[in-house]
């Protein structure tokens, strides 16, 4: 007779790992016990549990409660076991040993390996400002048995650097990705995968990019310098920019107050029925938490008595 | 002829603890499971322990589990019973007996000693 | 325990059946004590097996999970207490003995 088992068992942390063992003996031949010992290198042999052909199982206290036989029907020449819920201290070599009649005793081994899937975790760099040159976005870190694979999935120009930490059982990889932040990569997605055959799928964290930054201002409405005539009604200036965060915007006049009747909403400035007394230089002032911009305008409101117009200077400073 | 010799018994203290020894002879001793059985004054036969051929595999009645501890010596042919927490039921004729096979069954007794007698009291 | 009579009795010549059950495993033996205090004495072990010093008049047979001592032509020699063993999960066992009168 000879006995059939496996080189190697894998099984996923948490999940039941059958070591199978058996005895393909000619007819007549009867198995008395079949023992099952943990074998690693350098140790000596750790008795798991015994299948006895009268006795029926034992487990040695080690194993309590985690050692059981394969559910009915049983051959009686198949001493396979189960071992429950297994863990990564579980992973090594295996003895199965048979005793037949009369055939004698007959061994073999076989390697557990416990695939141990890892708990991907993403984070964040520091604030990405534009302007800055090249920037940690995100470090993603994954352990697992064995190594994990750790890539990124991204729209987004940049570079990544890996870095793998072994400890006894098991592996950390780290992986880094840099770039140099510019406004276009606001709100795109920063995607760490990580592969490994413990997963039934990869596992992917997704990361939205906020790059912080302020536009030039600019102010429009003054487009067309001959509306703005005594009398016109809805005269407005609005002041434009962009930025991360959103920015607030502030406007003041700089050769004296706002005029009277004058509304301020946001960006927006809103003038009553024009009068020579809006004429002047009005200055819109935009910040967020990574800067601010001014733009100012000069208005000058035309008397249609007058012949002449007048010019108008547009001035941006930052 | 098998024979088991068994030693160790008297009177001892409550609370302490005793060591009884069998040596074995007349048969292959490594090949055969071993046992304690015992008998209180007046009671039936009660399984104490037993022990497997290769000694990696021991079983205990439950009225000595946790306080007792069965081993075999191959090169001794012997067994022994270290039964510690001493209390007054233990006290009886400790018989040690042979497996006709690798376990310790009792349906598998084909052999026994003359047995030892212990008794707990102060 | 395994569970056995307390007693049986038969006059000399007759044939006296003990039965035992129980335990977790189908095999037992049956043991023979004369007078408490004396060794045991195999009669029957691995449910069928008789040592060889052991007259024939012992035999044992199994039906179904009860199992039989069958002592055929009682002798006065015979009286005893007659302890059936056997497993239970983890450990070995035994019944609490049944006491055979010979009238």
């Known amino acids: 007779g000879e006995l059939e088992t496996s080189d190697v068992v894998t099984v996923v942390l948490g999940q039941d790992a059958k070591l199978p063992c058996f005895y393909r003996g000619d007819s007549g031949e009867q198995v008395g016990q079949v023992a099952w010992a943990r074998v690693d290198a350098g140790e000596g042999a750790q008795e798991l549990a015994l299948l006895h052909s009268k006795y029926g199982l034992h487990v040695s206290p080690a194993y309590e409660g985690r050692v059981e036989q394969p559910p009915p029907p049983r051959n009686p020449l198949d001493g396979s076991v189960l071992l429950r819920n297994a863990v990564q201290a579980d992973e090594g070599e295996y003895e199965c040993r048979v005793s037949t009649f009369p055939a004698g005793s007959f061994q073999a081994r076989l390697r557990l390996r416990v695939l141990v899937p890892p708990l991907p975790s993403l984070n964040p760099g520091p604030a990405l400002e534009e302007g800055q040159g090249l920037t940690l976005a995100a470090s993603c870190t994954a352990e697992g048995s064995p190594a994990p694979s750790v890539t990124w999935d991204t729209e987004v120009k940049g570079t990544t650097s890996s870095r793998s930490f072994k400890h006894s059982r098991s592996a950390a990889v780290t992986s880094e990705f840099h770039l140099v932040p510019s406004r276009s990569m606001n709100g795109q997605p920063l995607t760490c995968v990580v592969s490994h055959p413990g997963l039934l799928q990869d596992q992917r964290i997704t990361h939205i990019l906020h790059v912080s930054f302020l536009a030039e201002a600019s102010v429009r409405g003054l487009e067309d310098q001959n509306l703005w005539h005594i009398g016109r009604e809805g005269a407005m200036l609005k002041c434009l920019s962009e930025g991360q965060p959103p920015p607030s915007y502030n406007w003041t006049r700089l050769d004296g107050p706002l005029p009277s009747g004058v509304r301020v909403d946001g960006d927006t400035l809103g003038f009553p029925p024009l009068t020579t007394e809006h004429s002047g230089i009005y200055v819109c002032h935009v910040s967020n938490e990574f800067s601010s911009r001014d733009s100012q305008v000069t208005v000058d409101v035309l008397d249609p008595q007058e012949d002449s117009g007048k010019q108008v200077d547009l001035v941006s400073a930052s | 002829a098998v024979t088991l010799d068994e030693s160790g018994g008297g009177l001892q203290a409550p609370g302490g603890g005793l060591s009884l020894v069998c040596r074995a002879s007349?048969?292959?001793?490594?090949?055969?499971?071993m046992f304690w059985v015992r008998q209180a004054p007046g009671k039936g036969l009660e399984f104490v322990a037993g022990?497997?051929?290769?000694?990696?595999?021991?079983g205990y009645g439950a009225a000595v589990k946790g306080r007792a501890t069965i081993s075999r010596d191959s090169g001794q042919s012997t067994v022994r019973l270290q039964l510690n927490n001493l209390r007054a039921e233990d006290t009886g004729i400790y018989y040690c007996?042979?497996?006709?096979?690798?376990?310790?069954?009792?349906?598998?007794?084909?052999?026994w000693g003359h047995g030892t007698e212990v008794i707990v009291s102060s | 325990a395994l569970t056995q009579p307390s007693s049986v009795s038969a006059n000399p010549g007759e044939t006296v059946k003990i039965t035992c059950s129980g335990g977790s495993s189908n095999y037992y033996g049956w043991y023979q004590q004369k007078s408490p205090g004396s060794a045991p004495v195999t009669l029957i072990?691995?449910?069928?097996k008789r040592p060889s010093d052991i007259p024939s008049r012992f035999s044992a047979s199994k039906s179904g999970s009860t199992h039989t001592l069958t002592i055929t032509g009682v002798r006065a020699e015979d009286e005893a207490v007659y302890f059936c063993g056997g497993w239970d999960k983890s450990a070995g066992i035994f019944g609490a003995g049944t006491t055979l009168t010979v009238l």
């Open positions: 022990i497997s051929d290769a000694g990696s595999w021991t």
């Open positions: 072990y691995n449910n069928n």
């Open positions: 007349g048969f292959t001793f490594s090949s055969h499971g």
């Open positions: 007996a042979k497996s006709a096979g690798d376990w310790y069954g009792a349906d598998d007794i084909d052999a």
